[in-house]
């Protein structure tokens, strides 16, 4: 959980499980106003380890739509457009927080949930196992 | 916001701003038990577009610690270990949800916030501008 001294100006919580249950304002504040996420939108196609984006939808989750990256190739794409199997395309994964409705279908009650998503792919050199 | 029909078994909300303010249980449910995120932990070093991970800490945010990837090179690393500037290392960015204490320092009141984080780097071919 999160332990920080209570401020006298804070909203009161009458929940007996406090501080495990908190109030969350869903009016999302977007900190990315100065950054345009579109600028990275074509990397999936231009990468030497290109990927496809698959839509994962779940109405019981917030956000309900998450995009999952799936690497297109096992190897990496060379300058001539062919796949080099001496290298490997691998997904870069990140653990993200989502809100899961609990109980199910309830509009105003959630539990925090951690899920692992693949954000994109990168090209790596394989680990060489030396035979003794 | 999130609009789903109310279920009679749901907790009641007396908040006048409902459904903008919801109850969230902070006992995180981790869906990643079968997946070991450690398996991708060395990609940052083995990638042709390697990256360093920088710790970003903010006690007013949940999670308070977020790791940001910074690409190590402007170009990409070739098989011989040298940097190739005909290709570029670029960050793969993802918008994630975090909880921001609001009002500040309050342990039980948050606002959802979207932030853009760099998760890792990928090697891309630059866009070729053809001259007419």
């Amino acid at each position: 959980g999160i332990a920080i001294p209570r401020n006298s100006g804070c909203p009161n919580s009458e929940d007996k499980n406090f501080p495990r249950t908190v109030m969350v304002n869903l009016n999302i504040h977007n900190r990315n106003t100065s950054t345009n996420p579109k600028r990275s939108s074509d990397y999936y196609n231009r990468s030497t380890s290109p990927w496809n984006l698959h839509r994962n939808e779940d109405p019981e989750r917030y956000p309900s739509v998450i995009w999952e990256a799936k690497c297109r190739h096992l190897g990496c794409v060379k300058a001539d457009g062919n796949v080099d199997y001496h290298m490997n395309s691998v997904p870069i994964q990140q653990e993200i927080l989502v809100l899961r409705r609990e109980p199910r279908h309830c509009p105003n009650s959630f539990r925090l949930e951690k899920i692992l998503v693949s954000v994109g792919c990168t090209c790596v050199t394989p680990i060489v196992h030396h035979v003794a | 916001g999130i609009a789903i029909p109310r279920n009679s078994g749901c907790p009641n909300s007396e908040d006048k701003n409902f459904p903008r303010t919801v109850m969230v249980n902070l006992n995180i449910h981790n869906r990643n038990t079968s997946t070991n995120p450690k398996r991708s932990s060395d990609y940052y070093n083995r990638s042709t577009s390697p990256w360093n991970l920088h710790r970003n800490e903010d006690p007013e945010r949940y999670p308070s610690v977020i790791w940001e990837a910074k690409c190590r090179h402007l170009g990409c690393v070739k098989a011989d270990g040298n940097v190739d500037y005909h290709m570029n290392s670029v960050p793969i960015q993802q918008e994630i949800l975090v909880l921001r204490r609001e009002p500040r320092h309050c342990p039980n009141s948050f606002r959802l916030e979207k932030i853009l984080v760099s998760v890792g780097c990928t090697c891309v071919t630059p866009i070729v501008h053809h001259v007419a």
């Epitope: - | 910074k70 690409c71 190590r72 090179h73 402007l74 170009g75 011989d80 270990g81 040298n82 940097v83 190739d84 500037y85 005909h86 570029n88 290392s89 670029v90 891309v124 630059p126 866009i127 070729v128 501008h129």
Partner: antibody, heavy 121, light 111 residues
């Protein structure tokens, strides 16, 4: 002979904007990444930003990210640095310089004479 | 970011002296083939000028009394016989990682 000539410097108030230009001659401009390097009065050299051959990817030092934008126009052999939300700590001589080239040589081979940017109220 | 630490920060020398300046990187700036370390000279009111690239290669037009050596994290710039026009500030710079970084400079003054 390679020549890089900067212009656009001057006195600006904190929070203000300035656009620097760098005109190149004697060099195949499109064969180089280009960069801006600055030097605060009496201090050392500090890389600010670089832009690749194709002008589609640029890199910035952390302290200027979101405030400065590097761009280039190969048809005019000109490099630009748009500086917004200027701070007093941005006061420096700004040098235009060639960065990596198509042979993967990645040192700052050619430099302009510099243009002074003063941020003061 | 890779930190480059030059030593000494300043030195006094006479014409004809052999001068050595060192640059230590916080991590390796060398690949198996190259060292991504370069040296520049700057005179007051002037732009920097490239002297040595990739640790040991003399830039065209630079006098042969200048030489560079080193790999990994430790690099050296040597002036074999200091000339009057060599009194200036010298900077090392690495291009191995982003961001590009410079040493703090070494000022060579007349004794």
């Amino acid at each position: 002979e390679v020549q890089l000539v900067e212009s656009g410097g001057g006195l600006v108030k904190p929070g203000g904007s300035l656009r620097l230009s760098c005109a190149a001659s004697g060099v195949i401009f499109s064969d180089y990444y280009m960069a801006w390097v600055r030097q605060a009065p009496g201090k050392g050299l500090e890389w600010v930003a670089s832009i690749n051959f194709n002008a589609d990817i640029s890199y910035y030092r952390e302290s200027v990210k979101g405030r400065f934008t590097i761009s280039r126009d190969d048809s005019k052999n000109t490099l630009y640095l748009q500086m917004n939300s200027l701070k007093t700590e941005d006061t420096a001589v700004y040098y235009c310089t060639t960065d990596a080239n198509r042979q993967n040589y990645d040192w700052f081979a050619y430099w302009g004479q510099g243009t002074l940017v003063t941020v003061s109220s | 970011a890779i930190q480059l630490t030059q030593s000494p920060s300043s030195l006094s020398a006479s014409v004809g002296d052999r001068v050595t300046i060192t640059c230590k990187a916080s991590e390796s700036v060398s690949s198996s083939m190259y060292s991504y370390m370069h040296w520049y000279q700057q005179k007051p009111g002037k732009a920097p000028k490239l002297l040595i690239y990739r640790a040991s290669n003399l830039e065209s037009g630079v006098p042969s009394r200048f030489s560079g050596s080193g790999s990994g994290t430790d690099f050296t710039l040597t002036i074999s016989s200091l000339q009057p026009e060599d009194f200036a500030t010298y900077y090392c710079q690495q291009s191995w990682t982003a961001p590009r970084t410079f040493g703090q400079g070494t000022k060579v003054e007349i004794k």
